[in-house]
């Protein structure tokens, strides 16, 4: 599919001008290559009329130009003094006319309307309001006032001062007679429809002395604004319909076959399932304007979008609207990243977030998409060290691996963590991406004690058991804080006995805290990584208390007496539900997480065959 994009249809009137914008991916080659505008012949060729290399056909001499805007990835063709002979099929493109890097444009030039003398022309947008003014003389001040519409050869009564209203205008028309001083009546028509366009006649009086005034009403369908965005990127539709509809329900819909327009999102709470998790409606300003952001753009998102206002929250005849034609460029600069990441209860996920590598200094954010309200994505963590209070100890945003990607790690997963999350920065708004976290059946791969109490001045050793599947990974311990997780020295204690059916490649890696101080209290993570790519993590809270009896503490996974909320497994390990701990000191010490099997694919959820963009909770 060609990545060149422009308007499919351009309509104008004889004598007027048009400006046609064509979009292209702004690669270095594209920016500098030849741009052209050509007319398609009946036998398939395309004859150049104007190009960026200076050529102008004699047909266009003195009335057309082509300007390239390489920084925007656009070029614009302006054509003046249009005639009906200019109607036809054209292409705007890059390189050689026959190469296929082009977009088809249909230009339709119509004759101007043949208007009667003394005709007032009213040009109004679809869905808006028009006021037709009708002057009269004093002798007709007390006589009947009326407005007719010319239908074919016959005038049809639309409204009159005796109270008649044509059924086609019910509920959206009124006739106002100005105060005695002004010899003028006016007809106001709201929620204009395309069918309202035409010739009108207003009249005061019914005899030969009546006053008449001709009016021509042109109802304009909004020209769609062209929007060119990258696959996997983000688009924002800014919708400003005017203060008169500030209190009316707003919607964004996508035109399907014919005149149908399927609601994508509206302010009444409706949202199309295809956009779940990747659309937000920003609340409206006082003037009634609002915006809709769609992220994770797909090929099938391309098409015509309308925003509008109507009490039903969907397109109806007479809704004021704004239109866009969205083109999704498949030659995207935005890299593929998993759209679904899976983890198990008690386990963890590591999410990779792409950003524009030109903006390495921008603030990175990770927020939780909220479906209940149309426009919320509350911040959970940022690259400046802010972490939402409820996520302390289990969430971290790392600038690694860098160069256009950052990492977010979330552990101590529960079913409540399932949902959609957005990666964004305070820079390029096109680089907003969405990831869905799914919680699946299985056990965490890393085994650590639940939470641990250390004694001031003593030594504490905390174990972390890694199954053999992580034999080739780097294993680490770190201390969590709100700016990341600071690496700590750890000791490899040899093979772990925490896994059944697991060979010598399983590992027990311990964290040792010597001469424990109050500053050692906090969250500790053990985890695996490969270079700058992070995999699973497990968290332990270490509380610090006053000395009771001398000696060092060596924390193990198993303990003879199981707490009431734990069940003892055959192997003597205890299994608990690893809940997100608000204040770990309120919980019994040394809760354990264990598993009697090596769940080779337990927490590293397997990739669904239906999707090429899913990753498990483990590292890549």
């Amino acid at each position: 599919k060609s990545p060149i994009f422009g308007p499919e249809e351009v309509n104008s009137v004889e004598g007027n001008s048009v400006s046609i914008t064509c979009y292209y991916p702004p690669t270095s080659v594209n920016r500098h290559t030849r741009k052209y505008w050509c007319r398609q012949g009946a036998r398939g060729g395309c004859i150049t009329l104007i190009s960026s290399e200076g050529y102008v056909s004699s047909k266009y001499a003195g009335r057309a130009n082509l300007t390239n805007f390489p920084e925007n990835g656009t070029f614009v063709v302006n054509i003046a003094q249009l005639s009906q002979d200019d109607s036809g099929r054209y292409k705007c493109g890059l390189g050689i006319n026959s190469r296929g890097l082009s977009f088809d444009v249909s230009l339709e030039v119509s004759q101007g309307p043949g208007l009667l003398n003394d005709t007032k022309v009213y040009t109004v947008d679809l869905g808006r309001t028009v006021t037709i003014n009708c002057p009269f003389k004093t002798e007709n001040a007390q006589k009947r006032k009326s407005l007719y519409k010319q239908i074919g050869l016959y005038p049809v009564l639309v409204i009159d001062s005796s109270g008649y209203v044509n059924p086609n205008y019910t509920g959206r028309i009124r006739l106002d007679i100005q105060g005695t001083g002004q010899l003028l009546f006016s007809v106001v028509i709201n929620q204009l429809r395309l069918s309202d366009a035409g010739q009108y006649l207003c009249q005061a009086g019914d005899d030969s002395n009546s006053n008449k005034k001709n009016a021509d009403l042109q109802v304009l369908k909004p020209e769609p604004e062209l929007v060119y965005e990258d696959l996997r990127g983000s688009v924002t539709f800014h919708c400003a319909l005017g203060p008169e509809v500030a209190n009316v329900a707003k919607f964004l819909c996508r035109q399907s076959s014919g005149e149908n327009c399927d609601v994508v999102v509206n302010t009444l709470g409706k949202r199309a399932p295809a956009f779940e998790g990747r659309i937000l409606l920003n609340p409206q300003d006082k003037d009634g304007s609002f915006s809709v952001v769609i992220t994770g753009l797909r090929k099938e998102d391309a098409g015509r979008y309308l925003c509008g206002a109507h009490s039903d929250g969907q397109l109806q005849e007479g809704s004021p609207i704004q239109a866009w034609q969205l083109f999704v460029n498949e030659e995207s600069t935005i890299p593929r990243s998993p759209t679904v990441v899976k983890g198990v209860a008690g386990g963890s996920v590591a999410v990779l977030c792409p950003y524009n590598r030109k903006e390495s200094k921008s603030i990175k954010y990770w927020c939780l998409w909220e479906g209940a309200q149309n426009g919320r994505c509350p911040l959970l963590v940022d690259s400046e060290g802010w972490v939402k209070a409820q996520y302390e100890g289990r969430l971290s945003l790392l600038e690694e691996p860098g160069n256009g990607t950052f990492t977010v790690i979330l552990n101590q997963l529960t079913s409540r963590d399932a949902g959609f999350y957005w990666c964004l920065t305070n820079g390029d708004t096109l680089w907003r991406t969405t990831v869905e976290i799914k919680i699946i059946e299985g056990e965490p791969n890393l085994k650590v004690p639940g939470n641990v109490t250390a004694v001031l001045g003593e030594t504490l050793k905390v174990p972390c058991h890694f199954p053999c599947k992580f034999s080739s990974y780097e294993k680490y311990w770190c201390k969590w804080n709100n700016t990341g997780c600071q690496a700590l020295p750890s000791q490899d204690e040899g093979p772990s006995k925490a896994f059944v059916n697991c060979d010598e490649n399983s590992r027990l890696v311990s964290l040792t805290l010597n001469l424990v101080t109050r500053a050692d209290e906090g969250w500790y993570w053990c985890g695996v990584k490969q270079g700058h790519f992070y995999g699973e993590t497990a968290a332990v809270y270490v509380a610090v208390e006053e000395r009771k009896a001398a000696g060092s503490r060596d924390v193990s996974l198993a303990k003879a007496d199981a707490a009431p909320d734990e069940k003892v497994l055959d192997s003597g390990f205890r299994e608990i539900e690893n809940k997100a701990i608000q204040d770990p000191r309120l919980f019994a010490e040394e809760k354990a997480v264990a598993d009697t099997r090596d769940q080779a694919d337990g927490s590293r959820a397997s990739v669904d065959s239906g999707s090429s963009e899913e990753q498990g909770g483990s590292s890549r």
Partner: nanobody, 131 residues
Amino acid sequence: QVQLVESGGGLVQAGGSLRLSCAASGRTSSIYGMGWFRQAPGKEREFVAAISWSAGRTYHADSVKGRFTISRDNAKNMVYLQMDKMKPGDTAVYYCAARRAPELLSDYTQKPEEIGTYHYWGQGTLVTVSS
């Protein structure tokens, strides 16, 4: 809700120094950033300085750069504005402001110097610089 109370205003001679304090109370865990603004008689409220609550990244208006310094003490929920080399043009009511963490997409692109970025405001403290 977050409550903000400014203190430290007063009369100072040109070239002198003053330190303003702002005490935050209430739901301080929701604070994402804080700032100082000022409003001179008959003029609009203008940005002076801002600081991010967690990282302490600072922003200063060009008109005060090199003279004013914003700082914070998270443990005490305090923000300070150290004003040195003061000028008569610095005379104004100084307001402390706090912002919540972003929630709406538009919040993520708001700048620390924009008044609309802030959700909570103090009553203000008057600073007069005499020549």
